[in-house]
């Protein structure tokens, strides 16, 4: 049994340099292990696809808000 | 491992200005947000404004408008906070914290600045 | 300005006691809430963002829960080194802003 887990950590080395539309968008996690170069988000689109973006991108702030406010709406 | 260097305390004269530093290291300032916050003695933490050090963007809280001007040196991953017109009311401890997201996972351990009349 | 209520300003536990904090906001703020622990002389610490999300290295008997304006801090047995202030933050929009802190202290 080892004495710990290794959990395999997510980072984002690169970001898109265009703006995703939001209907595509499906949801989003925040990046900000120190461990990664960069705070980022990955924007998980309706096809599945995993992108990662700058979170000091205007676009990218409103979108996930946007996100936020849809789960929020869906919620009972 | 992230390090936000402050430098301890500061005394300083009532009316005079004062700018204080943040050294970071472990990560890069550009790639993130530098923040401000405020905690006068026994009391709650305040955020002061932040900003983005890859273009020199600042956004305040509009109570520390004119009183407080955040600048940031990429050169040296240092990021500044500057007071100015100081009163009793500045007599504080000032952390800088980094986060883009609005919330703050490192933070500097401060440095208490004191206003003499 | 989104103004953020912390019920108590302090409040006497046991060591093992099951600690609640809530923590109130003015307007909805889509779960952007953290929550920090300050002990004296010390910068505050990371505990919780997203309302949930507890951070690497925080104890598993920390947890976050809430949505809309109403949000709680727990920890279920409390331990000697829980002793300290707890503060809410939301960062929906800026300016962010914080409760007025919550001080656990020993009975």
């Known amino acids: 049994q080892p004495d710990s887990v290794s959990i395999p950590i997510t980072c984002c080395f690169n970001v898109i340099n265009r703006k995703i539309p939001i209907q595509r968008l499906e949801s989003y996690t925040r990046i900000t292990n120190i461990q990664c170069p960069k705070e980022a988000v990955i924007f998980k689109t309706k096809r599945g696809k995993e992108v990662c973006a700058d979170p000091k991108e205007r676009w990218v702030r409103d979108s996930m808000k946007h996100l936020d406010q849809i789960f929020q709406n869906l919620k009972p | 491992e992230v390090q936000l260097q402050q430098s301890g305390a500061e005394l300083v004269k009532a009316g005079a200005s004062v700018k204080l530093s943040c050294p970071a290291s472990?990560?890069?300032?550009?790639?993130?947000?530098m923040h401000w916050v405020k905690q006068r003695p026994e009391q709650g933490l305040e955020w002061i404004g932040r900003?983005?050090?890859?273009?020199?963007?600042?956004k305040f809280d509009p109570k520390f408008q004119g009183k407080a001007t955040i600048t940031a040196d990429t050169s040296s991953n240092t990021a500044y906070l500057q007071l100015s017109s100081l009163t009793s009311e500045d007599t504080a401890v000032y952390y800088c914290?980094?986060?883009?997201?609005?919330?703050?996972?490192?933070w500097g351990q401060g440095t208490t600045l004191t206003v003499s009349s | 300005d989104i103004q953020m209520t912390q019920s108590s300003s302090s409040f006497s536990v046991s060591l093992g006691d099951r600690v609640t904090i809530t923590c109130k906001a003015t307007?909805?703020?889509?779960?952007?809430l953290a929550w920090y622990q300050q002990k004296p002389g010390s910068a505050p610490r990371l505990l919780i963002s997203?309302?949930?999300s507890l951070e690497t290295g925080v104890p598993s008997r920390f947890s976050g829960s809430g949505s809309g304006k109403d949000y709680t801090l727990s920890i279920t047995s409390l331990q000697t080194e829980d002793v300290a202030t707890y503060y809410c933050?939301?960062?929906?929009?800026?300016?962010?802003?914080f409760g007025g802190g919550t001080k656990l202290e020993i009975k």
């Open positions: 472990g990560l890069n300032i550009k790639d993130t947000y």
């Open positions: 933050q939301q960062f929906w929009s800026a300016p962010y802003t």
């Open positions: 997203g309302a949930t």
């Open positions: 900003i983005d050090p890859a273009n020199g963007n600042t």
């Open positions: 307007e909805d703020i889509y779960n952007r």
């Open positions: 914290a980094r986060g883009v997201f609005g919330f703050f996972d490192y």
